[in-house]
Interface confidence: medium
Amino acid sequence: EEELQVIQPDKSVLVAAGETATLRCTATSLIPVGPIQWFRGAGPARELIYNQKEGHFPRVTTVSESTKRENMDFSISISNITPADAGTYYCVKFRKGSPDTEFKSGAGTELSVRAKPSAPVVSGPAARATPQHTVSFTCESHGFSPRDITLKWFKNGNELSDFQTNVDPVGESVSYSIHSTAKVVLTREDVHSQVICEVAHVTLQGDPLRGTANLSETIRVPPTLEVTQQPVRAENQVNVTCQVRKFYPQRLQLTWLENGNVSRTETASTVTENKDGTYNWMSWLLVNVSAHRDDVKLTCQVEHDGQPAVSKSHDLKVSAHPKEQGSNTAAENTGSNERNIY
């Protein structure tokens, strides 16, 4: 009678994470009597996966659970596969005895696990930056296998080219991680822009995963200021407006100064939004020119998003006409809130 052979017909098996792997093994004879054991890896450090004779292996089932004794199929199924299960599995025949002794091993089956990458997480800089500055975005995805993966960056649908990507670890591993850093130049129109990191992997069946970052959380568009003077019906009053345009985010505080002295401070509330996502706001000051003998320097000072203040000044000429002299007050008006200061 020919000597028993242990046959593992599959050199390799590829299984998706979460699924069940079937590892096939047959013997050519029932002699010698003795159990089959399955191991992952070879040598003294090999890991016991299944022992026919004894032990509890909750994830392992035999393919033929309760079959006829003439059958010599020792195939097993391992449920709920994870990347940690990857490796070479050996079906080993033992000869019955006290103790059982190893008789013959199969050639081994390499189990490769396909694991999906995690949803990409995109993060931007910790502090806001202004247009024309270059900012870095990072994208991370973990837990995928095999190692081959494609990562692309987009800004508003346009592919970016200035990025650097690493896949770790470099050597063999049960699963891998990808880390990419992209450089993006900000423009004033980027409040509504999105940066997208797209990851394509064999496990995703052509449907890549995407992570996004809104540039609204990264950009700061500083305001432009314009101070203008309009006459009003009352000949001794002048309306001075400060147009605060194209700023983002909304957090803004405005202070009026008359000849360097604080006249009023207010916080932007009723703003108007532009198509590009930036905001406009206007504040005005009703100046009673008859209260002033000399020219007045009016300054609109704006502190935007905690940044150093920017300001714009306007020189108000005072003409000494008798009919314009009288009242000793300057009236200030912002919208419907009018108050006189004495």
Partner: antibody
Framework: QVQLKESGPGLVQPSETLSLTCTVS????????LSWVRQPSGKGPEWMGR???????AYNSALKSRLSISRDTSKNQVFLKMNSLQTDDTGTYYC??????????????????WGPGTMVTVSS | QFTLTQPKSVSGALRSTITIPCERS????????VSWYQRHLGRPPINVIY?????PSEVSDRFSGSIDSSSNSASLTITNLQMDDEADYFC?????????FGGGTKLTVL
Amino acid sequence: QVQLKESGPGLVQPSETLSLTCTVSGFSLASYSLSWVRQPSGKGPEWMGRMYYDGDTAYNSALKSRLSISRDTSKNQVFLKMNSLQTDDTGTYYCTRDRSMFGTDYPHWYFDFWGPGTMVTVSS
Amino acid sequence: QFTLTQPKSVSGALRSTITIPCERSSGDIGDSYVSWYQRHLGRPPINVIYADDQRPSEVSDRFSGSIDSSSNSASLTITNLQMDDEADYFCQSYDSKIDIFGGGTKLTVL
């Protein structure tokens, strides 16, 4: 839990046919094989035959000519028919659940659950 | 086809150790596995050892099985003998496609 119960006539006339039924619960006949084992009074047990999980049968060659085992999986029942009974067929008849030693294709079977047995007397 | 021979009876004192042999008539005892069963009067048999030396989880560790190639026999050993161990014990093995039982041993606890 796993249970097996034999039923049938306690007394059979010589030369007649014995019909026994084994009703099981707690497992599926599609997954486990069942054997019939008898123990004549004052002797050791004797394996009679097996109904495999897939419907095939195997018989003890000494009894094969007069033994037939069948099943009805929908009723969870396995049947034994043995003809031409003689007085030395008297004894306790058990149905047993078979277990492959390692829960897989391996040539060692043992009997992990037994029914209480039914006493069969062959007498005129 | 071989036979399995057991002594008709064995006795042992309470809390002692006894061994029940099961001799194979022909062929090597190592060519097939041996199982052991216990049967109390009026109760169905239960499996106490399978595969020569494997014990089902619900069976007391006082029960152990072994094989001895020099005597071509298998043995069931019961330590710390209890009154409830008094029962019939029989061994079982197989040859080709047939299961073979020993004649059974009556254990008496003194």
